[in-house]
Interface confidence: medium
Amino acid sequence: QHTCSISKVTSLLEVNCENKKLTALPADLPADTGILHLGENQLGTFSTASLVHFTHLTYLYLDRCELTSLQTNGKLIKLENLDLSHNNLKSLPSLGWALPALTTLDVSFNKLGSLSPGVLDGLSQLQELYLQNNDLKSLPPGLLLPTTKLKKLNLANNKLRELPSGLLDGLEDLDTLYLQRNWLRTIPKGFFGTLLLPFVFLHANSWYCDCEILYFRHWLQENANNVYLWKQGVDVKDTTPNVASVRCANLDNAPVYSYPGKGCPTSSGDTDYDDYDDIPDVPATRTEVKFSTNTKVHTTHWSLLAAAPSTSQDSQMISLPPTHKPTKKQSTFIHTQSPGFTTLPETMESNPTFYSLKLNTVLIPSPTTLEPTSTQATPEPNIQPMLTTSTLTTPEHSTTPVPTTTILTTPEHSTIPVPTTAILTTPKPSTIPVPTTATLTTLEPSTTPVPTTATLTTPEPSTTLVPTTATLTTPEHSTTPVPTTATLTTPEHSTTPVPTTATLTTPEPSTTLTNLVSTISPVLTTTLTTPESTPIETILEQFFTTELTLLPTLESTTTIIPEQNSFLNLPEVALVSSDTSESSPFLNSDFCCFLP
């Protein structure tokens, strides 16, 4: 009887020896084995010589085998796929001679500190190379010269500080490049050459925005639809491009693609890619967002910077998982610092605290009129919260400002909370809307959703108006939707959303703004716990009295966006904070940040 299970699928003999407590290759493997699974054993070391007689071996899985060394002293002429992931390899031997037919090599989640220059020599058929989650600090020049057929390269989650300038030379078939979560400060000029890369991941690096970044900035501008934010378990084809995820570590996390590069010298060789003198000036604007609690002690003032617009409000949403799970009643303040994106949770005990979000945006009243159209999206019955949108238009020759009214509808049996995004939108004279977003998220440890009040006022005198978005999100597992708008309607037997009282639209952007500086540094994650003894009804009655208030003087766009997780929504906007108070991270700090 074989130690391993044997089956035959797709014409190859498949032998599965996973998790058999093996310390060596089983003696009774069939000679015509085509697919061999040896994962989750305690092999320690492995030599390809032990498999040379398996002339049909095409797939070899050695993942999670506690490997500390690999010897390539035997030729496996048919091996196409080698999985060495989740081991303890600190170095790789030269692979080309032993594995000439290799098309996929996975050495992710090991302890590789460096790679020898010729480690991939001879791997002319290699199409996929996975090196993510190692300790790589640098890459040898010419590393990928032998692998001209490479399609996917994953170098994410390493400690790369720089990249060889010709790393991608000759890789005409490359379609996916993962470089996120490294220590990269810049991209060498000409790094991408003429490659057309459909999927590139560059976020969570220490991009240093100075004159050296201009090549990279221009590449981002030219390839904005190809830059993505990686999310675990989500296929890249199911995500939306997010060029704003690539941020300047030295400029309050402003997007690299909008770095202005003012004062940088121009050289004749830079003009194609680094022509930054043709970018129009943008008037300075400021929106101040204040988060305050009912304890009357803790107040943090935040400033927001305008960020580059996107065609849809959702397209630049970034989901970040909660980085701190409270174990008792407390408020958690997560401050993301630069460089390095270090997350430092600072916790302090407090009584159940209820927050109000104030966006103080003083604005010279613009004339407004309503357009009598309505927009609605129909959710799946009894599953999704309903989506209603009211949008405001400010036509050029309008005379009367009109406040908007928003109705939030919730299906009768919905168990998914209805988060509410209130968006203040007013077009700029240039017709390029500049959305900014503040996110206040109540995470799932709360047993009862906590109402969030948004008081929206108009900005300080300025002829240029900055759109502002406030996203209020309730916990994932709440079965009680949190009303955060002026009117909450629950249809008894209907799965059709109730249309808004008015739908107002903003002028469509005519151009794409590329030089706005935007920052996103700290994220306020508020975990709120209500007293267990308090009935839901009481809490609703007591604290939901102040709901989302749209002041009569306010021209606004209100969009109710269903969210199905408790992640923070971070569009390309800045919440800038610096904790200077002595007593608490929640005490005062004011900022005023201006666009270039």
């Epitope: 044997i6 035959k8 797709t10 014409s11 190859l12 003999l13 069939p30 000679a31 015509d32 049909h56």
Partner: antibody, heavy 118, light 113 residues
């Protein structure tokens, strides 16, 4: 030319045993996977068992645990040991050569009839 | 197990005329690694053993007349005889050689009208 000749069929009572043999010639027997396929009277074809050139056996659920395929490369012979026979095992049993590792059958013997009846 | 379904089960033909047999599988027989469809066709003439006609959907076995052709991909396959001859009568079987257990269609009986 390739020749496959089956033998060992006959009448057997339910629960009984029978051993079929297939003598191969005209090709390098040890280099090929071999199979048994059966055909009940007036019915279609049903794969019964295969054995790779290295000696690894395969069975469908219908015969697993009752039938055993084996080969003797020195004798260029293929065998099928059938135990616990049932009435539904009644069929003509063909010995066939499998092409490479692709498991389609390029040469067939003339078949041997196995009848399971009380 | 992959179920193979043939149609029609009986096909009266006229010599010199074309004939077509369909075979459908319950799951795809396409191997994405090599883009081959693992389907074979056999003919069992009256009183004889089956003989291989086509494998990998469209590759004719040596010695098989070129009036026999196979096509299809994924789950739908077809065997065509461009001009039926008297010697083509018998039962035609399709077989998937993609995944064990190897399974056959129930057969299509081709007979002269």
């Amino acid at each position: 030319q390739v020749q496959l000749v089956e033998s060992g069929g006959g009448l057997v009572k339910p629960g009984g045993s029978l051993r079929l043999s297939c003598a191969a010639s005209g090709f390098t027997f040890s280099s090929f996977a071999m199979s048994w396929i059966r055909q009940a009277p007036g019915k279609g074809l049903e794969w019964v068992s295969s054995i790779t050139s290295a000696g690894t056996p395969y069975y469908p659920d219908s015969v697993l645990g009752r039938f055993t395929i084996s080969r003797d490369n020195a004798k260029n012979s293929l065998y099928l040991q059938m135990n616990s026979l049932r009435a539904e095992d009644t069929a003509v049993y063909y010995c066939a050569r499998s092409r490479g590792y692709e498991d389609y059958f390029d040469y067939w013997g003339q078949g041997t009839l196995v009848t399971v009846s009380s | 197990d992959i179920v193979m379904t043939q149609s029609p089960l009986s096909l009266p033909v006229t010599p010199g005329e074309p004939a077509s047999i369909s075979c459908k599988s319950s799951q795809s027989l396409l191997n994405s690694r090599n883009q081959k469809n693992y389907l074979a066709w056999y003919l069992q003439k009256p009183g004889q053993s089956p003989q291989l006609l086509i494998y990998f959907t469209s590759t004719r076995e040596s010695g098989v007349p070129d009036r026999f052709s196979g096509s299809g991909s994924g789950t739908d396959f077809t065997l065509k005889i461009s001009r039926v001859e008297a010697e083509d009568v018998g039962v035609y079987y399709c077989q998937q050689h993609y995944s064990s257990p190897w399974t056959f269609g129930q057969g299509t009986k081709v007979e002269i009208k």
